[in-house]
Amino acid sequence: AFGISGVQKYTRALHDSSITGISPITEYLASLSTYNDQSITFALEDESYEIYVEDLKKDEKKDKVLLSYYESQHPSNESGDGVDGKMLMVTLSPTKDFWLHANNKEHSVELHKCEKPLPDQAFFVLHNMHSNCVSFECKTDPGVFIGVKDNHLALIKVDSSENLCTENILFKLSET
């Protein structure tokens, strides 16, 4: 099992954290798959996008997502790290003008069309177990991560005080 630590510690600080620049520090295209190698795909249906978690057929092309990384500063009185308490926030865009959003009321992950500046619901705190294995935590709801539930993306609460198996919130990034 993989543990996500520090979830409770910074709950208030995360709500108060600010994106230090309006421009991302880096951006790149990658395909997104689950820890169990299922692909995250996006389909246009009835003028809105649906998100699926599925096994691709051999040689089927993976959908790409534009990941934009932003630096986020913790208020020094909250983090204890002075000017040094930085996190990486990420936004995920599978197609122009559409971004993944956290719908905390419905515990769902949705694709919304919107203009910049993006709302807080489009920002996720990046955690990683290794360079290419990551988790996405809601900026608007600390302790809640994008995860896989019933072959769909959903918001999943991770209680760090319990020894939970959190493979369902782990995602792999690859350029292929």
């Epitope: 993989f2 543990g3 996500i4 630590s5 520090g6 510690k9 910074y10 520090i25 880096t26 790149y28 990658a30 990384y69 630096e71 913790h74 983090s79 204890g80 790290d81 040094d84 308490g85 930085k86 996190m87 990486l88 705190v125 990046l126 955690h127 990683n128 177990m129 290794h130 360079s131 290419n132 760090s160 350029e175």
Partner: antibody, heavy 121, light 106 residues
Amino acid sequence: EVQLVETGGGLVQPGRSLKLSCVASGFTFSNYWMYWIRQAPGMGLEWVSSINNDGGNTYYLDSVKGRFTISRNNAENTVYLQMNSLRSEDTATYYCARGHYYYTSYSFAYWGQGTLVTVSS
Amino acid sequence: DIQMTQSPSVLSASVGDRVTLSCKASHNINKHLDWYQQKVGEAPKLLIYFTNNLQTGIPSRFSGSGSGTDYTLTISSLQPEDVATYFCFQYNSGWTFGQGTKVEIK
């Protein structure tokens, strides 16, 4: 001010063990990945080992796997490198380093001054 | 495993010169690349992260660029205090340093 202080280096015979410690201060230790990087005399830098912020995930350079163990004590703001079955090619200055961002394994933002490990008979 | 190859191994230039150091990865590393400066007898220091972001406190004469497999560190006007060895480092898949480029003053 962020500080990392390594201790535990010294002269050791091949096949013996040594434990390095790195005490951190000036930041919230439990939020950051920590690393050991080494540099043989007159040579380049070589990543040795990594540990994530809660200590649940560890990674090693192939040549030290099964011999070295990285661990951390978040209550004491300390990261360790237990080195067993030491070889002459492990002779190097060992640096402790801290990640750049909370929760991620990207970049070595801060480094200690290093501690020299000499493996020789 | 990803290999990082730096060139040249040694670079001699005059004070005020524009200096370019190269780093090539064996695979696409998605801009997950840093540059570190190490002066003789000192610990390394982070200069540039994520290819082109200047670390706090580093002079603006240092800049980074690149994508895919090819990356560059540029010193726009070489200063005596820039004499050091410079290492590139990738963290896209595992963690790997280049072998270093030693920068000297002519």
